[in-house]
Interface confidence: medium
């Protein structure tokens, strides 16, 4: 008996108040289907109802969280319906406050190395979910460690490849309501570095400047990088600029740091638009020092 395929668009993790499309595909091409929810609170809008092609469900509430299956119309079956489809678990986010997501030792991970993603909260979540943006597969389910101050989970990810790099978020949930999730953590960009040769980094007018003077850092390479990323040691985040082809055949980006007040070690990386989370080796570090200022890091 033909078993249809149920899918959720844009994905199975849905913010409270948003809509999700449930699509039931029959290999035999029948486009009428019924939907059932196996657990959690009932959803009256599904009862005694036949859908055509796909169903736009929403605005979703915590009651919509749970496991769904569809049956497609099947004129050759004794009941007139196919066997039930694969299960699709709809998780509704925004029910609890957001956890925090960190990367140890940091979000820039050398190709082939391992990174630990730590999701933690002051809420006692027994379960955490780790979700990568743009991936329609179910999020990774992780068991939380409870402690007096809340809960956390450490997930070891590696060896690092471009396929694992991306924007991650984590969610928390409690045991008795496993599909009602917290708001998402702030996004964390995990970047794989060391995939291409290192660019060069230089400073104009030079790496030693007077306090309050303007300095521009130039990152360049003969590789066809679309984007350069500039990072400062011991600082989160990075500056990002589009590369420009120079007369000498190099691809370059100029980062105007403006009037500098304190120095530091800078590195730059190159990347391609098509793989935004896959970067080159870092440039050699460039120490920028500021004279006439006690905060010369």
């Amino acid at each position: 008996q033909d078993k249809p395929f149920l899918s959720a668009w844009p994905g199975t993790v849905v913010s409270e108040g948003q809509h999700v499309t449930l699509q039931c595909r029959s290999r035999l091409g029948f486009n009428e289907f019924s939907l059932s929810k196996e657990d959690g609170m009932p959803v009256p809008e599904l009862y005694n109802r036949i859908f055509r092609n796909s169903f736009l469900m929403g605005p979703v509430t915590p009651a919509h969280a749970g496991t769904y299956r569809c049956c497609s119309s099947h004129p050759h079956s004794p009941t007139g319906w196919s066997a039930p489809s694969n299960p699709v678990v709809i998780m509704v986010t925004g029910v609890h406050r957001k956890p925090s997501l960190l990367a140890h030792p940091g979000p820039l991970v050398k190709s082939g190395e391992t990174v630990i993603l730590q999701c933690w909260s002051d809420v006692r979540f027994e379960r955490f979910l780790l979700h990568r943006e743009g991936i329609t597969e179910d999020p990774l389910r992780l068991v939380g460690q409870l402690h007096d101050a809340g809960s956390q989970v450490n997930y070891s990810m590696g060896p690092m490849t471009p396929a694992l790099a991306g924007t991650y978020r984590c969610f928390g949930s409690v045991t008795h309501l496993p599909y009602e999730l917290s708001a998402p953590s702030d996004p964390l960009d995990i970047v794989v570095v060391g995939l291409y040769g290192k660019p060069s980094l230089s400073a104009q007018p030079g790496p030693t400047v007077q306090a309050g003077e303007n300095v521009t850092l130039s990152c360049s390479s003969r590789s066809l990088f679309d984007i350069y990323h500039l990072s400062r040691e011991a600082e989160a985040g990075e500056l990002r600029l589009t590369a420009v082809l120079r007369v000498n055949g190099t691809f370059q980006a100029n980062f105007p740091l403006g009037p500098v007040t304190h120095g530091g070690n800078y590195r730059c990386f190159g990347s391609f638009r098509a793989l935004p989370h896959a970067w080159s080796d870092p440039s050699d570090p460039l120490p920028v020092s500021v004279t006439g200022n006690s905060r010369n890091l």
Epitope: W9, P10, S15, E16, G17, Q18, H19, T21, L22, Q23, E45, R52, N53, S54, F55, L56, M57, G58, P59, T61, G94
Partner: antibody, heavy 122, light 108 residues
Framework: KVQLQQSGAELVRPGTSVKVSCKAS????????IEWVKQRPGQGLEWIGV????????NDNEKFRDKATLTADKSSSTAYMQLSSLTSDDSAVYFC???????????????WGAGTTVTVSS | QIVLTQSPAIMSASLGERVTMTCTAS???????LHWYQQKPGSPPKFWIY???NLASGVPTRFSGSGSGTSYSLTISNMEAEDAATYYC?????????FGGGTKLEIK
């Protein structure tokens, strides 16, 4: 300018079908919902259904389940509503509206088409 | 489904008068999901007030909205001729979205 342009008035026979169009301009068609609303002469507003042009997913008011079929064409940024087996009860003005939200959960209809008058008469 | 009942169905007010109309829901509605539309004869409804209290772009500040739970209202602080219209409340808290029957506001 954000606009929804609806097709012109229709005079149709009972038992036939009619297809009303709603062309969106001035915004990203697939980033919003298209809602359909019925208004009989001198009466209030009745929600017919909604389509997500991005996914093609629809939801409808039970009352219109066998009456209205909603579709959307992303390439032309146009939504359609086909009304079938027409009777005099279907004589009304039909509006399309953009489904938008404030914050994350607060849905409303912020832009409306001018309406398409459908008259069913023999 | 959530039923919205508007009262009065028809009302008239003098220019400069303060006007209040109400919308009662059959079940509690989130105040962020209760909206109002203005409609004049021969025209489509206009998006007027969203999330109970917020005025849509271009709506005069003499309009205001308030309420919570099952009871909501729209108020005009001093009636002007251009305010004569039918006003509909609308909830999109739960599917299906529903509209009230409307309050027709006329000039006395």
């Amino acid at each position: 300018k954000v606009q929804l342009q609806q097709s012109g008035a229709e005079l149709v026979r009972p038992g036939t079908s009619v297809k009303v169009s709603c062309k969106a301009s001035g915004y990203a068609f697939t980033n919003y919902l298209i809602e359909w609303v019925k208004q009989r002469p001198g009466q209030g507003l009745e929600w017919i259904g909604v389509i997500n042009p991005g996914s093609g997913g629809t939801n409808d008011n039970e009352k219109f389940r066998d009456k209205a079929t909603l579709t959307a064409d992303k390439s032309s940024s146009t939504a359609y509503m086909q009304l079938s087996s027409l009777t005099s009860d279907d004589s009304a003005v039909y509006f399309c509206a953009r489904g938008n939200y404030y914050g994350t959960t607060d849905w409303y209809f912020d832009v409306w088409g001018a309406g398409t008058t459908v008259t069913v008469s023999s | 489904q959530i039923v919205l009942t508007q009262s009065p169905a028809i009302m008239s007010a003098s220019l400069g008068e303060r006007v209040t109309m109400t919308c009662t829901a059959s079940a509690s509605v989130s105040s962020s999901s209760l909206h109002w539309y203005q409609q004049k004869p021969g025209s489509p409804p206009k998006f007027w007030i969203y999330s109970t209290t917020n005025l849509a772009s271009g709506v005069p500040t003499r309009f205001s909205g308030s309420g919570s739970g099952t009871s909501y209202s729209l108020t005009i602080s001093n009636m002007e001729a251009e305010d004569a219209a039918t006003y509909y409340c609308h909830q999109y808290h739960r599917s299906p979205p529903t509209f009230g029957g409307g309050t027709k506001l006329e000039i006395k």
